[in-house]
Interface confidence: low
């Protein structure tokens, strides 16, 4: 089961996989959780009774029984991986560590005003895993205010030592705070000729990219498909890096594909979750168990439920096509990937879904959308909520989007007349307003957070967060939408939809069924021409047709402008304002969410 508490002065005996250095027991737990095999760990804290060379060591452990004997040891802190836990897991660590030096390859040293400036530099430097900053009090004058950016092969320090007047910390790339670009293209018939830092077996280029994305040092990759001429290299995924951060040479070779790590937008792409099935494919690895099950989906479930299982192969028996059972081979390896991939043997293979919780829930696929029509169907926009006010009577006030299990993103102008969060109700998983009865469950609002610079919708900063009184459980009907990535600022979204229960025309009424409209994005320059009397800033985004027609309207405010990119829906805009509704030459104006990522992340992490 899930055990989150740490055990003080306790050491787990045996089961060692590897030893790394971490600045705290909590960070050791994070490293263990993200390691393919680690289930338990022991961390050696700074302690007078311990040899200082052992301080800050984090020993990652595995056990067939999922537990190990406990021994009393002063200064040792032990605990369990979060792999066994149902909750979301993030690799983000915003802490800084005073009087600690984290050792690694120093590749850049420059003057910074303070620790935060140094951390920001690390976050926006492609190679940086962590940093050490020497403050202005540092004894050696030439090192004062120096920010050292560092990397190691595994992303963790090679050693950690005590040193006064320095501060260390980690890159915040995994907190979605990096400005580095995300290159999402996969290039066919391309080999990148650079240093291989590792190689693994993968069934396709997408799995290869995901493996590259969660490997701390991989910046780009080359994948040899199953049709690659050299048999021994088929299904080989080469993880690569270079000094510049970009491939130095591209070679044209058929049956090879190459691409880039998505590390700086990993909060909005699946990195750990490989949910596809690979037909006529066998994954080889260390066998954990063989079970008789009905079908490959049941086999995947068995693997997901078995804590140590990383991947599986289902072998249908000749009778299984008539409803019989087949053999389910549960497997594991040292790195979480198959040791070999074979084709043409009739097996169906795949990966555990247990690691899916390490990805943002917003990246999981939703039901296919109904094309055409203006009325939505159940589960089509599961992040859309209807915000009701109860004063003077209960009515739909605004739309909003689920971005976290306790967070709704909406427009600030929705609260111009709202005195208190007590009168607000959030209804999720709703298609028709008539579904809402007295007995319909809702989420109360604990807190309204309006952007400090908001004055009125038309001048911008029309953004607000609602913190719910209780956390919501995600289902097919209610789940979050991904925030866009800073690294995706230059992406041209082509599949965008505005949704809401708002009026269908200016002098209209709230609609019963959630409406949807496909709208093209309009450039800021184009939009500025249409709104001469207003200042259209880069913090706004416009969408709509020149000829008018499809648009957001009264009652849609605060709702999402959702754009699908690479199979993942992103919250690109928040319905804010416009001249009339669906008027010719008057696009709708939306709050440009990517420009508020820092604000959203700080507010949701701070409260």
């Amino acid at each position: 089961g899930c055990i989150t508490e740490l055990l003080a002065d306790t050491c787990f005996q045996g089961g060692d996989i590897t030893t790394v250095f971490t600045p705290s027991a909590k960070h050791c737990q994070l490293v263990c959780t993200h390691h393919p095999r680690c289930l338990l760990f022991t961390f050696m804290a700074e302690s007078p009774s311990q040899d200082p060379t052992k301080w800050f060591t984090c020993i990652l452990k595995d056990s067939v029984t999922e537990t190990l004997p406990r021994v009393n040891m002063t200064g040792a802190i032990s605990g369990y991986s979060f792999k066994q836990c149902p909750h979301q897991i993030s690799a983000c660590n915003r802490n800084v560590y005073v009087d600690l030096v984290m050792k690694g390859m120093n590749y850049n040293g420059s003057i910074a005003r303070n620790v935060q400036e140094c951390q920001e530099r690390c976050t926006n430097s492609v190679h940086c895993h962590f940093f050490t900053y020497a403050t202005s009090q540092f004894p050696s004058a030439e090192h004062r205010n120096v920010c050292l950016l560092k990397y190691t092969e595994m992303g963790t320090p090679t050693r950690i030592t005590k040193l006064s007047m320095v501060v260390s910390g980690f890159s915040l790339k995994s907190c979605a705070l990096s400005n580095l670009a995300c290159i999402r293209d996969i290039f066919p018939s391309t080999v990148f000729a650079d240093n291989n830092i590792d190689s693994v077996m993968a069934p396709d280029a997408f799995v290869c990219r995901r493996i590259c994305t969660h490997h701390p040092s991989c910046l780009f990759f080359t994948f040899f498909s199953q049709e690659w001429p050299k048999e021994s290299e088929r299904n080989l995924c080469l993880l690569k890096t270079s000094e510049s951060g970009l491939p130095s040479t591209r070679i044209k070779k058929h049956k090879a594909l190459s691409g880039f790590s998505l590390q700086s937008c990993r909060h909005s792409v699946p990195v750990f979750c490989h949910s596809s099935f690979y037909h006529n494919t066998d994954f080889l690895g260390e066998e954990l168990d063989i079970v008789d099950v009905k079908g490959h989906e049941a086999c995947q479930k068995m693997c997901t439920d078995a804590i140590r299982c990383q991947f599986f192969t289902y072998s249908p028996s000749p009778e299984s096509c008539h409803g019989g059972k087949g053999k389910c081979y549960l497997k594991l390896s040292s790195n979480g990937s198959p040791t070999k991939i074979l084709h043409g043997r009739g097996g169906i293979s795949g990966y555990t879904l247990r690691l899916c919780k390490m990805d943002n829930v917003c990246t999981t696929k939703i039901k296919p959308r109904i094309v055409g029509g203006t009325a939505s169907v159940h589960g089509e926009w599961p992040w859309q909520i209807t915000l009701h006010t109860t004063s003077p009577i209960r009515r739909h006030l605004c739309g909003g989007s689920i971005i976290g299990n306790q967070w709704i993103l909406t427009a600030a102008h929705c609260f111009d007349q709202v005195e208190s969060p007590k009168i607000l109700r959030v209804y999720s998983g709703i298609l028709n307003q008539t579904e809402i009865k007295k007995s319909t469950s809702f989420f109360g609002v604990q807190k309204i957070i309006i952007h400090d610079q908001y004055e009125e919708a038309e001048s911008g900063y029309d953004i607000a967060l609602l913190k719910l009184e209780t956390a919501m459980n995600y289902t097919d009907a209610q789940r979050p939408i991904c925030l866009p990535s800073k690294g995706d600022r230059n992406v041209i979204y082509t599949d965008c939809w505005v949704t809401g229960w708002g009026y269908r025309r200016l002098a209209g009424e709230i609609q019963n069924t959630l409406q949807k409209a496909n709208v093209p994005l309009v450039t800021t320059e184009e939009c500025q021409i249409r709104y001469k009397g207003h200042k259209i800033t880069n913090k706004m985004i416009c969408a709509g047709y020149r000829e008018g027609g499809k648009d957001a309207c009264k009652g849609d405010s605060g709702g999402p402008l959702s754009c699908k990119h690479n199979e993942v829906w992103h919250l690109v805009g928040i319905t804010s304002w416009g001249e009339g509704c669906g008027q010719r030459e008057r696009p709708g104006v939306y709050t440009n969410v990517v420009e508020y990522l820092d604000w959203i992340l700080k507010k949701t992490q701070a409260v």
Partner: antibody, heavy 116, light 107 residues
Framework: QVQLEESGPGLVAPSQSLSITCTVS????????IYWVRQPPGKGLEWLGM???????DYNSALKSRLSISKDNSKSQVFLKMNSLQTDDTARYYC??????????WGQGTTLTVSS | DIVMTQSHKFMSTSVGDRVSITCKAS??????VAWYQQKPGQSPKLLIY???YRNTGVPDRFTGSGSGTDFTFTISSVQAEDLAVYYC?????????FGGGTKLERL
């Protein structure tokens, strides 16, 4: 041990200039930033500006045009100069040493009254 | 410039109580917040820096937490000598700035 001591004129007429000296001991000015902070009677603390170990300066935006901070490392002294004084500049003026961006050692402060 | 707001100018407490003082930054200041104690006629004294690190010699009843824009300073069990004015300060971006102060007084 670490000490900071402010010395100033005590009384200044409106529109005149002010010069306060902060003399430090127990540490070197090349290794530490020094801040100036003031506190009007019965009110809160206001950050005026600072001089970094390497001589760079930063100022409170509202007072930038009237403030100047300099130092003499060899004499272990930091100087705050402020011109065009008004009655609302009446306050206790402190210097303090930088510690991870905060202020770990403070002087006792010197009281300035701006009055005709 | 970053504005630091301490919403309570005064807080009443009794010896042995747990008390929390909040401070809000107008923009993200990461974890760069310090807390000071000032008693009448004395210079301010640094208690906490970088949100949660206690200065040398500061009793462990004083703790700090938060990140981004919302910060909290807590005294787990108030002692008579803790009655004073407490200030928060951001040291993220110059010009650095203080909160308006919270006076902790006897109930």
């Amino acid at each position: 041990q670490v000490q900071l001591e402010e010395s100033g004129p005590g009384l200044v007429a409106p529109s005149q200039s002010l010069s306060i000296t902060c003399t430090v001991s127990g540490f070197s000015l090349t290794g530490y930033g020094i801040y100036w902070v003031r506190q009007p009677p019965g009110k809160g603390l206001e950050w005026l500006g600072m001089i970094w170990g390497d001589g760079r300066t930063d100022y409170n935006s509202a007072l930038k045009s009237r403030l100047s901070i300099s130092k003499d490392n060899s004499k272990s002294q930091v100087f705050l100069k402020m011109n065009s004084l008004q009655t609302d500049d009446t306050a206790r003026y402190y210097c303090a040493r930088d510690y991870y961006g905060s202020k770990d050692y403070w002087g006792q402060g010197t009281t300035l009254t701006v009055s005709s | 410039d970053i504005v630091m707001t301490q919403s309570h100018k005064f807080m009443s407490t009794s010896v042995g109580d747990r008390v929390s003082i909040t401070c809000k930054a107008s923009q993200d200041v990461s974890t760069a917040v310090a807390w000071y104690q000032q008693k009448p006629g004395q210079s301010p004294k640094l208690l906490i820096y970088l949100t949660s690190y206690r200065n040398t010699g500061v009793p462990d009843r004083f703790t700090g937490s938060g990140s981004g824009t919302d910060f909290t300073f807590t005294i787990s069990s108030v002692q008579a000598e803790d009655l004073a004015v407490y200030y928060c300060q951001q040291h993220y971006k110059t010009p650095y700035s203080f909160g308006g102060g919270t006076k902790l007084e006897r109930l």
